[in-house]
Structure formats: structure tokens, C-alpha cells
Amino acid sequence: KKVVLGKKGDTVELTCTASQKKSIQFHWKNSNQIKILGNQGSFLTKGPSKLNDRADSRRSLWDQGNFPLIIKNLKIEDSDTYICEVEDQKEEVQLLVFGLTANSDTHLLQGQSLTLTLESPPGSSPSVQCRSPRGKNIQGGKTLSVSQLELQDSGTWTCTVLQNQKKVEFKIDIVVLAFQKASSIVYKKEGEQVEFSFPLAFTVEKLTGSGELWWQAERASSSKSWITFDLKNKEVSVKWVTQDPKLQMGKKLPLHLTLPQALPQYAGSGNLTLALEAKTGKLHQEVNLVVMRATQLQKNLTCEVWGPTSPKLMLSLKLENKEAKVSKREKAVWVLNPEAGMWQCLLSDSGQVLLESNIKVLPTW
């Protein structure tokens, strides 16, 4: 008996071939001997089966002795043994129809779980193997689960169902809803304008939700809300904004905020959350602001940084084109009685300069 695997919703063509290469009488029946379709001369006739409106054949092939049964919009319950009667012969084809669906929305928040459920006909014992867009393989039976979805899991999942040494392939598009970056850091000199951008890692035609930016300044004992906003069809509207700092927010995606100037009291870290309509959970992006200030007070030249810096960052003070006078893994460095010239304060990571501030020291007479 020939075995054919089909996919729920698809179309399948079951073949039946006569030895004579001409149009002769044929019938297709199911295992209950109920006629599905056949011919009367050059006319297609249909029986009382439940496939009536979904069954068809290819009349153009009859003259070549081919009498296929075409079943459209396959259902799991179409799984059956189909019998083609032609030239006093019976050809049996076993059709097994499978369906594979994500049992939740295919748009999932980062960190959520994806469960794929296999619908299969009674009596079948299929195995399923799925390959994620980042090349990870998972195997299972009737259900497959992937916990803690990551951004790289966005894309087409290819799942292969194996039964009786035959296989059928499913493709499921999964969208992981997340910001492009989990965290970002902005380095600014005191007084410079600050821009924070929160690009999303997905695109949808209509995006609706609400969000908030909470800020924990390094100098403050507790965090405070800086801005709340709504998102409607990709348009951002500010609901409430703090008066210090004087924030501005762009009205279109990607989410974008500007501070008129970087000040030590704003240095710290923020958490932007975005709750999307009809989704449980929120998207998060952390943003950090590091502010540098170089000052000269009487005979003391000081360079300071505020905000979340890693312990391996180096803070240096150097006279232009000369060796660093002082370099420390600390948040403040100073030089007493600095010589005249253009001094540079540098914040660097393994030799790469992240932030630089220049200060001119005038000669003392």
C-alpha cells in the first residue's frame, strides 16, 4: 500500500494509472466503499462522500491513462485509505494528513515560550524535528516547546514530520517582539545634547501600546518616571513628561528621546518599557548615560565621570601630544599645578577612547 503524507490546508494529488494509455472508466472510493468521484465517458461524476466539494480530477490526463484524485483544503479527518478502481484492478493509497500550528500567537515577546502542536490522524506515530532560524534543532512528538525565545529565533521555523519513512515539511513564521538591543550606553561631555534611540527588532503594519521610561540617576536615592507615552498605529503621543530634564520625544518610530544637555545629575541608567496591545508582558531596553566634566579650580585640574562605568574603564588626564600625567581606574582624576596648554580628559576601554573633553589651562604670571 502506497503512503502519501499531506498538510492540513494544502492540496494533495493521489495518482492512479491504468496500463492502457486511454480514457477508460475509473472510480475513487474511500475505505468505507463510498464513491468519491469517477467518470462517465468524458464527464466527471461525484459520489456522496464528505469530500464532494473538495475533490477533483485532471481530465486532461485521462487520455494518457492517468486518473488522479485531487483533494483541496485538506483536513486531518481526510486521512484514510483511498481506493482507485480501474481495469478490474484496485490501487490503494493511504493518505495521512498532518497539521502543525503554534498554539499561541506567532508574535511572541522575547523571553516567552513557543509551543508547536502537531495534529495527526488516529493510529499514526509521527516524529517531528524543527530547525530554528539560528540553526537550533529540537525534536518531539505531538508537542514541541522552546522556552526563553531570543531575538535570533525570529524568522522561519522549518519542521519536518516523519511517518512511515515519508516526510512532510512545515514552515512557520515566528516574530519575536523585542528591542534591537537589550542595553545601550551613551557617553557625553557635560552640556552636550543627548539622544536615546530605542529601535524595535520587528516591523508590523499597526503597532499599538503604551510605554514609560524610568530613570535611576546615580546621585538619586530612588528611580523616577521621566516620561509616559502611548503608541497608536506607530504614532507616538506623550502623555506625561517630567519638567527636569526637559525631555522631547519623537512622534514616530523608532522611539527616540532627546535631552537638551547632559548634566552630572542626569547620569545614570534608565529602563524603557513598552506594553503592546493584546500581549502579556512588556518589552524592555536599558539605557545608560555617562557624563564627563573637566574643570580647573585654582591650581587643581580635575576630570570626573558620572554614571554606570565598568571597573575596567580608564580615566586619564594628559597634556596634548604628551604622555598621560595620570591614569586610573577611578571616576575622578586630577593634576595639581598643571602646566599651561590644552589638556585632554579621556575615558577609554582597552585603549579605545569612549569620551574626551578638552580644557585649556592658561599660563599663570
Epitope: 545634547q193 543627548v194 539622544e195 502611548d230 497608536k232 498605529n233 504614532e235 503621543s237 506623550v238 522631547q248 520625544m249 519623537g250 512622534k251 514616530k252 527616540h256 532627546t258 537638551p260
Partner: antibody, heavy 119, light 107 residues
Framework: EVELLESGGGLVQPGGSLRLSCAAS????????MSWVRQAPGKGLEWVSG????????YYADSVKGRFTITSDNSKNTLYLQMNSLRAEDTAVYYC????????????WGKGTTVTVSS | AIQMTQSPSSLSASVGDRVTITCRAS??????LGWYQQKPGKAPKVLIY???SLQSGVPSRFSGSRSGTDFTLTISSLQPEDFATYYC?????????FGQGTKLEIK
């Protein structure tokens, strides 16, 4: 082709009211954000008010906040500007403008309607 | 509200000249800035959107650029029909704000 046609301008006394209309043709009104922009005689352009495509969010310049109200009627493809407590400094040509779908810029403008506030 | 400072307020030039007009934003506004041309008695017309994108149907002698919060409109070779008033408009956030305008006159 998208066209915008303003109407409702005229002469009104200080403290009076006026309602401007902007009839749109050739577009699905609810898809686009719309704005009112004015120009006082011999002066530059001043953005007055805006409304989101859905009509849910409205925005105003500080100079008209609390006195002007922007609304839209999607079934009539018409944008309105209700102007109350009018002042002499509201005298201007009022333009309505449509924004692009993916961009905020004003790609289509009406010809304008003149509002004169004088006693 | 975001302030837009446009300069110069007026400019005299000749046909064939290269002309630049600048706008400075008081806040970072990404590329969310457009340039508009207005002729007497007419409605404004968009030339450049998103700081540097040329609106369909606008001659290629018009171009826009951005450096931080400074935006520039350049007309590479003035034509007689270019004598008009030019405005920048920040459409980054509400309330939108225009620059004060630059009147371009024939020398």
C-alpha cells in the same frame, strides 16, 4: 489626485468664533495625520494644530491652546478648526495640510482661507 | 517647544548662484525636518523631507543635509523660478515649529 479645500474664513469681531472646514478628496482620511498652519499678513508660517489619523490625539500651539479645537469627520473626509475667543493676532490665512503616511512632512496643502479679526 | 533658528532672514543672489540656507534645532530632532518653498499668495510646497530626501517632482538642484542639530538647504544653481521664501519645519514632535523664513531675492 489628493486635494484639500478650506472654507469658513471671514471677518469676525474680537472675542467671536469661527469654524474652518477642510474638505479632502482622493484619500482615505483616517490614514493620515492632518494639520492647520497659518500665516499672518507679511509674516512667516506658524503651525497651529494637528490631529492623528485615528482622530484620537490632538495637538495645539501654545498661542491657541484652550481657544481652538481641531476635529475630523472621517465619514465626510473633512477636517475642522473651531476657533473661539478670537483675537486680532489670529488674523491670518489658514491652510490645512496632510502629512505623508510613513513620514511626518506635509506633502499636500490647501489653497488657504482668510480669517480677519477686527472690530 | 523646540525652537528652530533659521538664517539668513533674507538673501540676494543671482541666477546660477549656489545658495545655502541653514536651520538649527534647539533639541536633537533626528532627520525629522522638511524644507518648504512659498511664493506670494500661494500655499507652501515641500521640497525636501527627512532632512535630505527630495520630494517627487522637485528639481535635483535642491538638496538637504544634516550635521547634528544643524540642517542645510542648498540650491546648486539658482533658476528664476527659485526666488521665493523658504521655511524649515521640525516635525519630530508636537508642537511642530517652523523657522522664521528666508526671503530669497534677485540681486
Amino acid at each position: 489626485e489628493v486635494e484639500l479645500l478650506e472654507s469658513g474664513g471671514g471677518l469676525v469681531q474680537p472675542g467671536g468664533s469661527l469654524r474652518l472646514s477642510c474638505a479632502a478628496s482622493g484619500l482615505t482620511f483616517s490614514t493620515f495625520a492632518m494639520s492647520w498652519v497659518r500665516q499672518a499678513p507679511g509674516k512667516g508660517l506658524e503651525w497651529v494644530s494637528g490631529i492623528s489619523g485615528s482622530g484620537e490625539n490632538t495637538y495645539y500651539a501654545d498661542s491657541v491652546k484652550g481657544r481652538f479645537t481641531i476635529t475630523s469627520d472621517n465619514s465626510k473626509n473633512t477636517l475642522y478648526l473651531q476657533m473661539n475667543s478670537l483675537r486680532a493676532e489670529d488674523t491670518a490665512v489658514y491652510y490645512c495640510a496632510k502629512e505623508g503616511y510613513n513620514w511626518n512632512y506635509m506633502d499636500v496643502w490647501g489653497k488657504g482661507t482668510t480669517v480677519t479679526v477686527s472690530s | 517647544a523646540i525652537q528652530m533658528t533659521q538664517s539668513p532672514s533674507s538673501l540676494s543672489a543671482s541666477v546660477g548662484d549656489r545658495v545655502t540656507i541653514t536651520c538649527r534645532a534647539s533639541h536633537g530632532i533626528r532627520n525629522d525636518l522638511g524644507w518648504y518653498q512659498q511664493k506670494p499668495g500661494k500655499a507652501p510646497k515641500v521640497l525636501i523631507y527627512e532632512a535630505s530626501s527630495l520630494q517627487s517632482g522637485v528639481p535635483s538642484r535642491f538638496s538637504g543635509s544634516r550635521s547634528g542639530t544643524d540642517f542645510t538647504l542648498t540650491i546648486s544653481s539658482l533658476q528664476p523660478e527659485d526666488f521665493a521664501t523658504y521655511y524649515c519645519l521640525q516635525d519630530y514632535t508636537y508642537p511642530y515649529t517652523f523657522g522664521q523664513g528666508t526671503k530669497l531675492e534677485i540681486k
